[in-house]
């Protein structure tokens, strides 16, 4: 039995996967910030987690996925105000009783030190210094991500 949040997450990911392939992104769009091989958009307004998820989707992006502690720290360094929380693409899967990224993978317990409970209708937010479990209905800011396409040097055979 999937919760409404889980269903929303799955539906949006599936609709994103169905869209036609677009040419790779070489530069970040206006108002987006580059962080390594990603473009990040830090929202100014606030929304519950599922609206944030949907908003990123309309921008042909996804809620932020964090690979490891190093990427978390670099992302947190871009947050200017220590009091502000941002949704990322991680929520509690009731059916699997585990934290699950919106791409379907599970959280490696070593990656993020989460403050708060792992329970139904819990979603993950980050601040300048910490990672929190919040009720998914809480209205806070959010971070969208787009992957940059790496520019590969063309290798020409000897003439």
């Amino acid at each position: 039995q999937k919760s409404s949040i889980e269903k929303c997450s799955v539906d949006i990911q599936q609709s994103r996967n169905k869209t036609t392939e677009r040419p790779g992104l070489l530069n970040c769009p206006i108002y987006w910030q580059q962080l390594r091989e990603k473009c990040l958009l830090f929202s100014h307004t606030v929304n519950p987690w599922n609206n944030s998820l949907a908003d990123c989707s309309t921008k042909e992006s996804s809620l932020l996925l964090i690979r490891d502690k190093d990427e978390l720290i670099h992302t947190q360094n871009l947050i200017r105000d220590k009091a502000i929380l941002f949704w990322i693409g991680l929520n509690f899967s009731l059916s699997e009783k585990n934290w699950k990224w919106i791409n379907g993978s599970f959280l490696n317990s070593n990656d993020l030190e989460i403050r708060g409970d792992a329970k139904e209708n819990s979603c993950i937010s980050i601040s300048q210094t910490s990672v929190y479990s919040e009720y998914c209905s809480t209205e806070i800011r959010w971070i969208c991500q787009k992957e940059l396409t790496p520019v590969r040097n063309k290798v020409y055979p000897d003439s």
Epitope: H44, T45, D55, T58, K59, R80
Partner: antibody, heavy 117, light 110 residues
Amino acid sequence: QVQLQESGPGLVKPSETLSLTCTVSGDSISSYYWSWIRQPAGKGLEWIGRIYTIGTTNYNPSLKSRVTMSVDTSKNQFSLKLNSVTAADAAVYYCARDPLGTFFDYWGQGFLVTVSS
Amino acid sequence: QSALTQPPSASGSPGQSVTISCTGTSSDVGGHNYVSWYQQHPGKAPKFMIYEVTKRPSGVPDRFSGSKSGNTASLTVSGLQAEDEADYYCSSYAGINNLVFGGGTKLTVL
């Protein structure tokens, strides 16, 4: 180049509903938020509200009870309805692109609405 | 009554600098770095000049600059030119997805 164009009836009777549409060209409506702003003759600007393309809306608290906004992504349009209008609602109405919900980088040319019986 | 307070008028001679203030509260200007400025010539739509307090969109001359101290934001126009004569409006995010404008300042180039 992004362009916005307001359209609708220029004359509305008191107590009736003002309806305006903004058509966006040169950009997909889906990637941004969109706002309505008005300016009574000789006065300052007033933010009316914004719509996200997922359908979520934020309205100016002073107008919230009378405002409805909607979006039609297939037509690249968004709309404003303001009910129970009075003479105080007569103004030039602007639609604008609202990229992050805190500023307006592209504006329509403006549309004059007169309220009179 | 506008939520943000601007002086009704400001003036300067060509080549001079003029600063227009925009005073709010800790709930709007003082509480967020989301102040923007717009220039409006008579009969025209407003033009986007400054966002996030200090950032200038492409195409806006670097004679225009923004700053903020406490609950007051400022727009400075240096090297004043005749075409800068217009109305200027500030705007600020006011929390919980709300947004407010100032009453506007008429800038006259003497």
